[in-house]
Amino acid sequence: VSITKCNSDMNGYCLHGQCIYLVDMSQNYCRCEVGYTGVRCEHFYL
């Protein structure tokens, strides 16, 4: 799978994580920080 950093327009897309662009899948993906989940790392869990 080809990946690259997200475009600058997606700054802030991932609330608590790193945004990765999955080129072959034509979509952005959020790699969440520890303790966060959700498509955009918007949910905190203990």
């Epitope: 690259t4 475009n7 600058s8 327009d9 997606m10 802030g12 897309y13 609330l15 662009y21 080129v23 034509s26 979509q27 952005n28 498509v39 955009r40 918007e42």
Partner: antibody, heavy 116, light 106 residues
Framework: QDQLVQSGAEVKKPGASVKVSCKAS????????IQWVRQAPGQGLEWMGR????????KYREKFEGRVTITADTSTNTAYMELSSLRSEDTAVYYC?????????WGQGTLVTVSS | DIQMTQSPSSLSASVGDRVTITCKAS??????IAWYQQKPGQAPRLLIQ???TLQPGVPSRFSGSGSGTDYTFTISSLQPEDIATYYC????????FGGGTKVEIK
């Protein structure tokens, strides 16, 4: 199956406002950005602006600033684009476009006609 | 705002010809360019994103290349069904479409 279903065609008088809706099904708009693009008859595609429904944050093209308002209601999974002070040059097909989780998935378009 | 200058605005070519369309950005767009095909009365159809990544179901005669500010879209062998208007779109910083290229058969 993911879908963006837009409201029906509108005819408006100059100076009036129009509000076009874009209802998502099959996915949660909070996971995406919703863009709005328009196309006047026989003309090219023009990006108008977008909303991040999760945060409620908007970005607009400079030429539309102050005249366009993009909103989202996450409880109904629907985005809206309102354009005010309509003029004949605003006659166009207006599209909502999903981006983020999937690159550029388009609604079917809504024709807005501005005529006196 | 980033400007996208697309050329030519129209072209006429024969079936089987190689067709090339260019888009020049006013600043580096880091390969974040997409190409759309639009036929009359239809919504635009995404052909290519991230400069050269072909979408599923798109014929391999369509291709894209470029970097920095200069990008190219190519139809290696024009087919009658390719008659349409083609648009580039930069999506690095917000979004800007090129002016479009109308492709006709000679």
């Amino acid at each position: 199956q993911d879908q963006l279903v837009q409201s029906g065609a509108e005819v408006k008088k100059p100076g009036a406002s129009v509000k076009v809706s874009c209802k998502a099904s099959g996915f949660n708009i909070k996971d995406t950005y919703i863009q709005w693009v328009r196309q006047a008859p026989g003309q090219g595609l023009e990006w108008m602006g977008r909303i991040d429904p999760l945060r409620g944050r908007t970005k607009y093209r400079e030429k539309f600033e102050g005249r366009v308002t993009i909103t989202a209601d996450t409880s109904t999974n629907t985005a809206y684009m309102e354009l005010s002070s309509l003029r004949s040059e605003d006659t166009a097909v207006y599209y909502c476009v999903r981006s983020g989780t999937l690159f550029d998935f388009w609604g079917q378009g809504t024709l807005v006609t501005v005529s006196s | 705002d980033i400007q996208m200058t697309q050329s030519p605005s129209s072209l006429s070519a024969s079936v089987g010809d190689r067709v090339t369309i260019t888009c020049k950005a006013s600043q580096d767009i880091h390969k974040y360019i997409a190409w759309y095909q639009q036929k009359p009365g239809q919504a635009p159809r995404l052909l290519i994103q991230y400069t050269s990544t072909l979408q599923p179901g798109v014929p391999s005669r369509f291709s894209g290349s470029g970097s920095g500010t200069d990008y190219t879209f190519t139809i290696s062998s024009l087919q009658p069904e390719d008659i349409a208007t083609y648009y580039c779109l930069q999506y690095d910083n917000l979004r800007t479409f090129g002016g479009g290229t109308k492709v006709e058969i000679k």
